[in-house]
Amino acid sequence: LTVETTQDILRAARGRSVTLPCTYNTYVSDREGFIQWDKLLRSQTERVVTWNFVTKKYIYGNRYENRVRVSNDAELSNASITIDQLTMDDNGTYECSVSLMSDQDVNAKSRVRLLVLVPPSKPDCSIQGEMVIGNNIQLTCHSAEGSPSPQYSWKSYNAQNQQRPLTQPVSGEPLLLKNISTETAGYYICTSSNDVGIESCNITVAPRPPSMNI
């Protein structure tokens, strides 16, 4: 008995469907045993679906009832499953196990990793610190959603809408602006991006003199 998944990693967008491939080969014609899919996480493992060759009955894990379909060719050699309505909770490693009582090797398995893709949500831009000349401030940018985790980059524009270089690396967040001055004034755009999307937010920086600090 041999079991294989044709891909190590699968990527699929949230809300869509994905087929996790699994095929098995055996010389046994009298099939008695199981096909089982488990979801393996560091914190726990849970059953996705179990199919009994003899009773032809399925058992579905709670989170997968009405959302998982086993291949129509399960009795032949195709143990693949399709998961519908993907959510972020479906991220993880899935293990396909096939056991046949009359096969010498009895049980074999293979794995596939599922990465559910979600474009970044519109990031929140905010300023930490007082916008007073001479102060240091931090510009933060964060997307609540995004898979894979979004990458953040910054661009800066002066009052004349001309892009200007940033004195520190433009990627990552937060962006630290030291000893701010009127030269720092303008607006800053944070771009949050991953493999499936891009979103941005902007912040206006207008340093005021210390005398205006109340």
Epitope: T45, E46, G61, N62, E95
Partner: antibody
Framework: QVQLVQSGGGLVKPGGSLRLSCAAS????????MNWVRQAPGKGLEWVSS????????YYADSVKGRFTISRDDAKNSLYLQMNSLRAEDTAVYYC???????????WGQGTLVTVSS | AIQMTQSPSSLSASVGDRVTITCRAS??????LNWYQQKPGKAPKLLIY???SLQSGVPSRFSGSGSGTDFTLTISSLQPEDFATYYC?????????FGQGTKVEIK
Amino acid sequence: QVQLVQSGGGLVKPGGSLRLSCAASGFTFSNYNMNWVRQAPGKGLEWVSSISSSGDFMYYADSVKGRFTISRDDAKNSLYLQMNSLRAEDTAVYYCAREGPGTPFDYWGQGTLVTVSS
Amino acid sequence: AIQMTQSPSSLSASVGDRVTITCRASQSISSYLNWYQQKPGKAPKLLIYAASSLQSGVPSRFSGSGSGTDFTLTISSLQPEDFATYYCQQSYRTPYTFGQGTKVEIK
């Protein structure tokens, strides 16, 4: 035929360590998840730990997390449970059990007694 | 963790009696429920898996039913060798958990 033969139990002082072994035969050991289950004297069964067939996913009961380590050596067809910082409440008969798809815990070892006492 | 509660904790019955043991899960476990029999000084033995499937070699007087949170083990006609302790166990999600056991004694 499938066999699970256990060894390594005994008397140990609180705070001490012990390593249990479970030697498997009669099946392709490397294809199966394996488990440890224990039973305190006069009490019920308590699942202790599980290890995936490839040895990269390990799970533990809260009562032993951080103190016990499950491992396997497929070349030797053996399952292990390293028990550290032992407490009186760890006193129990420990069983290894095979976990098959569809039929979990279908074969069990004979059990080995671990006594934690000063 | 999913809690498993068995009832009764013990029962007295005679040979030939019909015996029913129940098991309740603290949350739905679909049909990932197994029943084991254990005799003193011995390792547990798998009787029923997937709530209602009889393990190979187990007499047909044993049967299981239920899904979701409520499950039942029935022995249709108790035999002398059936006096033992019975445990339910969920295998839906780790940590796998057992019920506290039901001891079936001779009346």
